[in-house]
């Protein structure tokens, strides 16, 4: 069998459009594909952040590809040409790789970058990120946050910083239209008169960092002599009922503690006639049907039912938060 040598694509490069980690990989067709004019060649593209164990592999007929990367690390990529099986008349094909790398030249020592970056998407409505200044940075250091997601023309800077001692330590984001279920990119860079400050890059999806409001309107209903139904309502806001999981804490007569996780806004509790007091609190979290992760809400106000006979439905609402 003869062997065909096929060149790799030309001008293979990684281009940074300024989207804080969303990069373009692009190339041109290989030289001298004259023998294969009738064939639709494909390209096998492999890429990863440097230090990652696995390559991501794409096969495409296009001359470009886009994906997100962690710009705190370098990126390596390689590409070669593939010929369709039917094109080669049984000949073996040797296809060499073109390789390229990309990284942002780091400024400043790692300790100068922001510490303990924490972002929460409150009630699927308000994004707030906070951080601590880098270790050993002077008071003249200030940090700036930039963000981008698909749908924005360019990266935007935070316009509502949270400050402490004149330094930016957080950002309150504006309304973010059509921003969930896609990668959300953040860069926090800094400036100082005295020394360069290392930039930090973060990527997450907003639906995975939601902290809902606590459930409301907690009530009791006697179902039978030995069953009480606990009910509550979803909090106000954009999160639909199908997206919630709940955790309940129930105390009977200040001793028995029952905890349960449920998917609906009700829980049926077995009780005895001796029960004198019943209190419960509920908290909510976005479930696996709507996100890959989430943050538990605060506990609801405590709702208690007291009296000689629970069936009299004597309700006492305690307006302090349970911790």
């Amino acid at each position: 069998d003869t062997e065909i040598k096929v060149n790799p694509p030309q001008d293979f490069e990684i281009v940074d459009p300024g989207y804080l980690g969303y990069l373009y990989l692009q190339w041109q067709p290989p030289l001298s594909l004259d023998h294969f004019k009738e064939c639709t060649v494909e390209y096998e593209l492999k890429y990863r952040n440097i230090g990652s164990e696995t390559w991501k592999t794409i096969i495409t007929k296009n001359l470009h590809y886009k994906d997100g990367f962690d710009l705190n690390k370098g990126i390596e990529a390689k590409i070669h040409t593939l010929l369709p099986w039917q094109c080669t008349n049984g000949s073996e094909v040797q296809s060499s790789w073109a390789e390229t790398t990309y990284w942002i030249s780091p400024q400043g020592i790692p300790e100068t970058k922001v510490q303990d970056m924490d972002c929460v998407y409150y009630n699927w409505q308000y994004l707030l990120c906070s951080w601590k200044p880098g270790i050993g940075v002077l008071l003249d250091t200030n940090y700036n946050l930039f963000y981008w997601y698909e749908g924005l023309d360019h990266a935007l800077q935070c316009v509502d910083y949270i400050k402490a001692d004149g330094q930016n330590i957080g950002c309150r984001f504006p309304y973010l239209e059509a921003s969930d279920y896609k990668d959300f990119y953040i860069c926090v860079n800094g400036s100082s008169e005295n020394k360069p400050i290392r930039s930090s890059y973060f990527t997450f999806q907003l639906q995975n960092i939601v902290k809902p409001l606590p459930p409301v309107y907690l009530t009791f209903t006697r179902e039978s002599s030995c069953e009480i139904k606990l009910k509550w309502s979803i909090p106000l806001g954009p999160i639909p009922a199908r997206c919630f999981d709940y955790e309940i804490e129930i105390r009977e007569d200040d001793t028995t503690l029952v905890t349960a996780t449920v998917e609906n806004e009700t829980y049926t509790l077995k009780t005895t006639n001796e029960t004198r007091q019943l209190c419960f609190v509920v908290r909510s979290k976005v479930n696996i049907y709507c996100s890959d992760d989430g943050i538990w809400s605060e506990w609801s106000d405590k709702q208690c039912w007291e009296g000689e006979d629970l069936s009299k439905k004597t309700l006492l609402r305690h307006h302090h938060h349970h911790h």
Partner: nanobody, 115 residues
Framework: QVQLQESGGGSVQPGGSLRLSCAAS????????MEWFRQGPGEQRELVAH???????EYADFVKGRFTISRANAKNTLYLQMNGLKPEDTALYYC?????????WGQGTQVTVSS
């Protein structure tokens, strides 16, 4: 005629399982690298899993621990066991046979994960 034929796709609820098969004809697959790719709407084909001639396997990060690739050389067939399926696994799944710089594709089988 050399060809690959996938089967086993279908519709399943989140958390469900499917087993895809890829039968080769006109070629003996025992000495070839075999792979599963998938292609979502408007996306490029991305590698899901890869198996060498001596059955060493590699998986994309997004399926590790959920999918298992295997091969039965005597039956000239490649398999993909898919457990813990998620809505984002919805795609057309293709098997591919690799030999150097040439590639043979199957026609694909549709997997839909929806509640």
């Amino acid at each position: 005629q050399v060809q690959l034929q996938e089967s086993g796709g279908g519709s399943v609820q989140p958390g469900g399982s499917l087993r895809l098969s890829c039968a080769a004809s006109g070629i003996n697959i025992s000495s070839d690298v075999m792979e599963w790719f998938r292609q979502g709407p408007g996306e490029q084909r991305e590698l899901v899993a890869h198996i060498t001639t001596n059955s060493r396997t590699e998986y994309a990060d997004f399926v590790k621990g959920r999918f298992t690739i295997s091969r039965a050389n005597a039956k000239n067939t490649l398999y993909l066991q898919m457990n813990g399926l998620k809505p984002e696994d919805t795609a057309l799944y293709y098997c591919a046979l690799r030999r150097g710089g040439r590639i043979l594709w199957g026609q694909g089988t549709q997997v839909t994960v929806s509640s």
